[in-house]
Interface confidence: medium
């Protein structure tokens, strides 16, 4: 490559080998060849000889000028025409790059997906820089003032094992390249508040043989501590609208929820929970489908090995009400 050229002279770039895209650029070549008084000095960009805007400054030096250089990367080299030599003689080469200083990273968010063991932070890097840009995530404990740094691209996974300095942190990103440096706004995170809980699981359903058939859904929330608020939504697969049942209790064991459903119908159930005082809901559990019997006989459903792909309509829930819309949300 260009970087390994053994130069017989010098090549330099003004304003520099890395510069802002759209700038005017001059590339200089100065020969220091033995036994050669060059007739001409030639410039090549990405292997193609330049024909225009070349100026011979003196016996040993020439310049090529580019107006509004807009290529992210280019390989430049220059050669000399030596009298009596059939081939041009290589003088020197340089890789040049153009781009932009980084934007201040924006829209930073950090979450802990339950049981992942990581705090995952993402951000918007802004417009492309076209040049090598490093992102450093700074994490400062507000309880101990300890600060840690992590090198990243456009996201970072930080082991929760390393977050030993308490619950509250300031997190920000610094973007740096050869053309500039920008910091994001500082994000204050409370680890309790950014946990995205794992979904609950509906394990089975059964409809009992009775005068009024009753369907029991067996399910378990993975939220194990404190009080939990849960919602179970269900609907016939032929319906657009979800019905929602709400639960508010202390769950550490398998729950049983009872429903009185139409016979000979296919229903889909989903459940989600939220720890009391916690910001984030679990995602809706995988859809669980149960077929009610035609007549009074017992039917049991178990979850399939493969998740069932069922298009469902989400519900906007108010206590005691249900309305449907046309977006998909199957958890």
């Amino acid at each position: 490559g260009i970087a390994t050229i053994n130069c017989s002279g010098n090549m330099w770039v003004e304003p520099g080998e890395i510069f802002q895209m759209g700038m005017n650029v001059s590339v200089y070549c100065q020969e220091a060849l033995k036994n050669c008084r060059p007739r001409n000095l030639h410039f090549y960009k990405n292997g193609f000889k330049e024909r225009f805007h070349i100026t011979r400054i003196n016996r040993t030096t020439a310049r090529v000028w580019y107006k509004g250089f807009s290529e992210p990367h280019a390989s430049m080299y220059c050669t000399a025409e030596c009298p009596g030599r059939f081939q041009e003689t290589l003088i020197c080469g340089k890789d040049i790059s153009s781009g932009y200083p980084p934007d201040a990273p924006s829209n930073m968010t950090c979450v802990i997906y339950e049981y992942s063991g990581n705090m995952t932070c993402t951000w918007n890097t802004g417009k492309p820089t076209y040049i090598d840009t490093k992102y450093t995530v700074h994490v400062k404990s507000l309880e101990t003032e300890e600060q840690q740094q992590y090198l990243a691209s456009n996201y970072v996974n930080i082991s929760t094992d390393s977050l030993q300095g308490g619950r509250k942190y300031l997190v920000w990103v610094q973007a740096v390249n050869a053309l500039g440096m920008e910091n994001s706004q500082q994000l204050q995170v409370h680890l309790d508040d950014i946990v995205i809980p794992s979904p609950s699981i509906i394990s089975r359903a059964e409809t009992t043989n009775a005068n009024v058939p009753k369907t029991i859904i067996y399910w378990k929330s993975k939220i194990m501590t404190g009080k939990v608020f849960c919602e179970m939504r269900y609907k016939a697969t032929t319906n657009q609208t979800w019905n929602v049942k709400e639960f508010d209790t202390n769950y550490t064991y398998v729950q049983q929820s009872e429903f009185y459903l139409e016979p000979n119908s296919k229903y889909v159930f989903q459940v989600r929970c939220q720890g009391t005082g916690k910001r984030n809901w679990q995602p809706w559990s995988s859809p669980f489908v149960h077929q009610t019997p035609q007549t009074a006989s017992q039917v049991t459903s178990k979850p399939p090995h493969e998740p069932q792909k069922i298009e469902m309509l989400t519900a906007t829930i108010f206590k005691g009400h249900s309305t449907s819309d046309n977006s998909q949300d199957i958890g």
Epitope: S141, E143, T144, E145, Q148, Q164, R167, V195, T225
Partner: antibody
Amino acid sequence: QIQLVQSGPELKKPGETVKISCKASGYTFTTYGMSWVKQAPGKGLKWMGWINTYSGVPTYADDFKGRFAFSLETSASTAYLQINNLKNEDTATYYCARRDRYGYVAGAFAYWGQGTLVTVSS
Amino acid sequence: QIVLTQSPAIMSASPGEKVTMTCSASSSVSYMYWYQQKPGSSPRLLIYDTSNLASGVPVRFSGSGSGTSYSLTISRMEAEDAATYYCQQWSSYPWTFGGGTKLEIK
């Protein structure tokens, strides 16, 4: 079960150095920070600072900057407290203590070593 | 730094009696933690996050409070509860303990 076992009592002269160990067992050592707490005879508890066992970075409370040093031997699941240039007022029981996690964050000191009595006397 | 002031410094109670001790913070804190220490022993965690009982702690212990005022209550004093009790905060660096309340049995 989780245990923090500290080294035995020490009798030192002023100006000497002491190094106390705290060996952890029953959990992954690098998952929880280790704090050190001082208790002078007949007095209350004073938090000295802590060391992040994942990164090895120590943090010292203001009163314990200078002569005090926290360190780790991760392969041995052991944390150390070293006190240099001992003074009479360093006479105390020193505890290592590990925070627990409630949910996904570090909480209170749920686990304590048995304490190491350091006596400084000429 | 946040100073935690415990009161009373020393108190005594008869078996079966209700006991309340307080911890006052010089600035508002988010959570309070309580420890029990008996002579010759290491401290033991009683209450975390202001009101949650640590593992193995009898239900006669309870914690409450918010802002700058917190309390620890023993609903019915037992002989084994004679000890020194410390409050502690994590909300602001450096972490600090209160001076302790020594609870004696009558």
